[in-house]
Interface confidence: low
């Protein structure tokens, strides 16, 4: 019989229901915005905005200060008071729409939904390791703001993204706001603008450059700004918007907008469609060619990548990559395929595609009928003409006008659909050692920390845990403070270590010590932990073998049994070759001699399953007693593997030594030609791994084996005679004297 060890699913080596408690802060209301600050003298802070209030927290998430930002018109509003005596507009709650750091001062800038979307500047005051906010400055000059031209009207109640860039000594605010007809009519925020913060912090300089959705499209064409960031020479905005000005406005897609970070100009404003797809390795019948589109960006983050992912993306280590989580539509519910997919867009490649698109539009010969695009911002035109003009005049340049690049940038899901039903609502990517890790928040309030690799058919989890018991969605914006990430869910802010919350979710020593170095996991006798959790027994260099099963569960007291042991951490080397003298198996008092591994039996084990087998020959000692006993495997002096060495003992109960007893044989005669069906009855006849019925020394072919009965077909006899009949179990004869008589056929 060829018994094989049962597979253990890879998921059995971890438990994502393990509870982790991470530091948290209850903000007293739904968290609307969050930003962190780290000074160069060890001082740091977390700023958390909720409706009508701004909290200042220390690095330990303890409250340091709290500031009333609304309601507007309320005498208790501390920020409103900075604008002098009112009225300043209709009273109402202040929902924070913008919370950014101006690195030049440094200062915190907050902008809300009230008071025409104006902003407030709060100078930072380090106090030891904490930071306080100085009295706010109102970034609004009544004399130069009008409903139709308002440089100080920054935030839209429908949402605004801001990135601050230093150019020389000046701070430029790159602002992108969602508009509709009502918002546009009220102190006219712009869709995209670049505003310079005045040196005296009295507001933003007038005469700023801007693009806005044209009035005729405001009702039907809405742009959601999902993310903004600055890297290299550019500022980027990510949008979700209708694919066409003229077609169905519910058919959405994702675009990247690029603006110069070195010149406060919008002439080189460029847009590029980002196309993210799920392309399963085995395409279903009827599935679209090139994969299923996931056109709607939910969250995004850009980060430099580690060596392994860089290689897979064919870029250099440390290069900046834009990561986006995409869904099939606004509601996020797909037909088939995963709920969320993650695509990676190397920034250098984005820039190259944009530059090539400019060449196609502006360098002759220009393809006839190639449109400049962005018809929601500007008059329609064909390349190379400027917007609204039939031809290029000598003193204008094709390149100095906004452009939609004619080709899209297409990528496939890095996770190959493995996020499955998970709905990702937050994303932050970090590089740890050579590893690129995606820290994701989910719709049901969990954090997934997963290595970003594309070549696998399973997810490499750093962690997967629940932030709390509320199960509320994790919000889009994530901030970093030192070695921690700050996630918001409901009214709480949670501080999650970048290295993961702990190691207790790794259930086996092997899985524990194979964890990434940065996690600091070690084995503590019977659990995986960080050193502070179990300083006495914590170690990172060896794992004991682990026996999970063996076969058979019984063997004869006399005679040998071929014992197969199942488990993990037997070898560490894929070949499963065992150096001499490293593995010692005992069953009760009896040794079990290791057998060389049969290479013909080696079969590839999928990485999602794992099992190791070890075979040995059990020859009970004369002193061994009948009855139940333990199987023990001890491994010593094994050469180290890549992550650890195997060292230690594993014991498993449940083996029994038995004495087979033969009670009856029938019939006791049969034809010389053979073929008589012999029935041998007794006890413990099926123990061990080998048995043979011998008729005159020749094997009687076994047809059935059970604990109390053996059936076999007699071999042909040489002559008519009475011949000895014996039963051997494990090569040893079962006591008893039996004969079988061959008769004439």
């Amino acid at each position: 019989e060829d018994w094989q060890c049962p597979r253990t699913p890879y998921a059995a080596s971890r438990d994502f229901d393990v509870k982790y408690v991470v530091p948290s802060f209850s903000a007293g209301g739904l968290v609307q915005a969050m930003v962190t600050y780290e000074g160069d003298r060890n001082e740091s802070a977390v700023f958390v905005a909720i409706r009508n209030r701004l909290h200042v927290l220390g690095p330990d998430l303890k409250s340091v200060q709290s500031l009333a930002t609304g309601p507007a018109g309320d005498p208790g509003c501390q920020t409103c008071a900075a604008c002098g005596p009112g009225p300043h507009g209709p009273p109402g709650d202040t929902d924070t729409k913008v919370l950014v750091l101006d690195p030049a001062l440094p200062a915190l800038v907050s902008c809300g939904s009230s008071l025409q979307g104006r902003c407030f500047l709060h100078d930072l005051e380090p106090q030891g390791t904490a930071v306080h906010l100085a009295a706010p400055a109102c970034l609004f000059s009544a004399h130069h703001n009008r409903p139709d031209d308002c440089p100080d009207c920054v935030a839209s109640p429908l949402g605004t993204r801001v990135t601050v860039v230093e150019q020389g000594q000046a701070s430029y605010f790159y602002v992108a706001s969602s508009l509709d007809a009502a918002v546009a009519a009220s102190f006219s925020p712009r869709s995209v603008s670049i505003r310079r913060l005045k040196a005296d912090a009295s507001g933003f300089a007038p005469g700023f450059v801007a693009l806005s959705v044209l009035p005729k499209h405001l009702v039907s064409y809405s742009i959601e700004y999902v993310h903004s960031f600055h890297t290299g020479a550019f500022v980027y905005f990510l949008t979700v918007q209708p694919a066409s000005v003229t077609d169905d406005p519910s058919a959405l897609h994702t675009r990247l907008a690029r603006l110069s970070a070195t010149e406060p100009e919008l002439g080189d404003y460029r847009e590029l469609v980002l196309d993210c797809r799920f392309a399963p390795k085995r395409r279903r019948r009827g599935a679209p060619e090139g994969g299923q589109p996931y056109p709607v960006l939910r969250v995004a983050h850009s980060a430099p990548v580690g060596a392994q992912l860089a290689t897979e993306l064919s870029i250099a280590e440390g290069q900046e990559v834009l990561f986006g989580v995409f869904v099939t539509g606004k509601d996020g519910g797909p037909g088939v395929g995963p709920n969320s997919v993650v695509c990676a867009f190397p920034i250098d490649l984005l820039d190259t595609l944009i530059d090539e698109g400019v060449e196609r539009c502006c360098e002759s010969p220009v393809h006839p009928g190639l449109r400049r695009g962005l018809d929601f911002f500007q008059s329609p035109s064909f390349c190379p003409n400027p917007p609204g003009l039939e031809a290029l005049s000598p003193n204008t340049s094709c390149r100095h006008f906004p452009l939609l690049v004619s080709s899209s940038f297409s990528r496939v899901d890095l996770f190959n659909g493995l996020l499955g039903p998970v709905q990702v609502t937050a994303l932050y990517v970090t590089r740890l050692d050579n590893v690129t890790v995606a820290h994701m928040g989910t719709m049901d309030g969990r954090i997934l920390q997963v290595e970003l690799v594309r070549s696998l058919n399973y997810l490499l989890y750093v962690s997967n845990f629940s932030l709390g018991d509320s199960g509320q969605p994790v919000q889009r914006d994530v901030s970093r403070l030192g070695d921690h990430l700050l996630f918001a869910s409901g009214d709480q802010v949670f501080q999650v270590p970048i290295q993961g919350p702990g190691c207790r979710h790794f259930l086996t020593c092997g899985r524990c010590l194979r964890a990434w170095h940065f996690m600091g996991c070690g084995w503590c006798g019977n659990m995986c932990g960080q050193q502070k959790e179990c300083p006495g027994s914590w170690q990172q260099d060896h794992c004991p073998p682990k026996l999970t099963e063996f076969h058979p569960h019984s063997g004869p007291l006399r005679g040998s049994t071929r014992l197969t042991l199942c488990g993990s951490n037997f070898y560490l080397h894929p070949s499963g070759l065992v150096p001499e003298g490293t593995h010692q198996v005992t069953v009760g008092q009896s040794p079990c001699r290791p057998l060389p591994k049969d290479s013909s039996k080696l079969r590839p084990v999928p990485r999602k399953d794992f099992v190791e087998e070890f075979e040995c020959e059990l020859e009970p000692l004369g002193t061994q007693a009948v009855g139940p006993t333990n199987v023990s495997l001890t491994v010593t002096n094994m050469p180290p593997g890549k992550h650890f060495r195997v060292d230690g003992t594993s014991v498993l109960r449940g083996f029994s030594f038995m004495e087979p007893v033969l009670i009856a044989v029938q019939p006791l005669f049969g034809p010389r030609a053979g073929g008589t069906c012999l029935t041998l009855e007794g006890q413990s006849l099926s123990v061990g791994t080998s048995r043979a019925v011998l008729v005159n020394g020749t094997e009687c072919l076994l047809a059935r084996v059970s604990e109390g009965q053996l059936l076999c077909a007699t071999p042909p006899g040489a002559t008519v005679a009475s011949v000895p009949l014996s039963l051997q179990v494990g090569g040893a004869q079962v006591p008893g004297s039996w004969t079988f008589q061959y008769r004439e056929d």
């Epitope: 050692d433 170095h517 170690q539 990172q540 260099d541 894929p574 070949s575 180290p640 992550h643």
Partner: antibody, heavy 120, light 107 residues
Framework: EVQLQQSGPELVKPGASMKISCRAA????????MNWVKQSHGKSLEWIGL????????SHNQKFKGKATLTVDKSSSTAYMELLSLTSEDSAVYYC?????????????WGQGISVTVSS | DILLTQSPAILSVSPGERVSFSCRAS??????IHWYQQRTNGSPRLLIK???ESISGIPSRFSGSGSGTDFTLSINSVESEDIADYYC?????????FGAGTKLELK
């Protein structure tokens, strides 16, 4: 920037003992293991042993078992190797080299080496 | 102990040439081999780990291959700054051991 700074050159008499140091900077000291490697003049490299900078656990090359004692001072992020009962055979350059566990047993950063001369 | 045999002891090359260093282990060590460069009066520097895994900051002209007992380090276009001693090291078994080295010199 990762740095391993070793103490200066030493001239010692036969029979004496000496302690050489390797001060680490630019990385999380206790997450690593420190190797010590000997290089006699014009010869190859010989692994002496290593010490876990977190718990002080050591592993030695049997050849150097009574010759080298490895210790660590976490408070100063410094690893030490004491060489005992020195003979002319111990004249060599001694290197410390960081070992990153997850990357396996490759030595990714090395000290500048300390030249030890044993002579009467 | 595992013995690592490097050959040749000395390699003479001209700039721009492709060069290969050999390292043979006395027993099967999988891919647990690492390559180091040591310039005159300098410390060893890690070039390749686990037979073929590249190291951040090391020029792409350096590559490694092999498994089992035979390993190769290659430089696809030698530059003058590559003149140095090259050592292989195994991490399959205690004690960790190094090869005797190959000296790369200019013709």
């Amino acid at each position: 920037e990762v740095q391993l700074q070793q103490s200066g050159p030493e001239l010692v008499k036969p029979g004496a003992s000496m302690k050489i140091s390797c001060r680490a900077a630019g990385f999380s000291f206790t997450g690593y293991t420190m190797n010590w490697v000997k290089q006699s003049h014009g010869k190859s490299l010989e692994w002496i042993g290593l010490i876990n900078l977190n718990n002080g656990g050591t592993s030695h090359n049997q050849k150097f078992k009574g010759k080298a004692t490895l210790t660590v001072d976490k408070s100063s992020s410094t690893a030490y190797m004491e060489l005992l009962s020195l003979t002319s055979e111990d004249s060599a350059v001694y290197y410390c080299a960081r070992w990153l566990r997850r990357g396996g047993y490759a030595m990714d950063y090395w000290g500048q080496g300390i030249s030890v001369t044993v002579s009467s | 102990d595992i013995l690592l045999t490097q050959s040749p002891a000395i390699l003479s090359v001209s700039p721009g040439e492709r060069v290969s260093f050999s390292c043979r282990a006395s027993q099967n060590i999988g891919t647990s081999i690492h390559w180091y460069q040591q310039r005159t009066n300098g410390s060893p520097r890690l070039l390749i780990k686990y037979a073929s895994e590249s190291i951040s900051g090391i020029p792409s002209r350096f590559s490694g291959s092999g498994s089992g007992t035979d390993f190769t380090l290659s430089i696809n276009s030698v530059e003058s700054e590559d003149i140095a001693d090259y050592y292989c090291q195994q991490s399959d078994s205690w004690p960790l051991t190094f090869g005797a080295g190959t000296k790369l010199e200019l013709k």
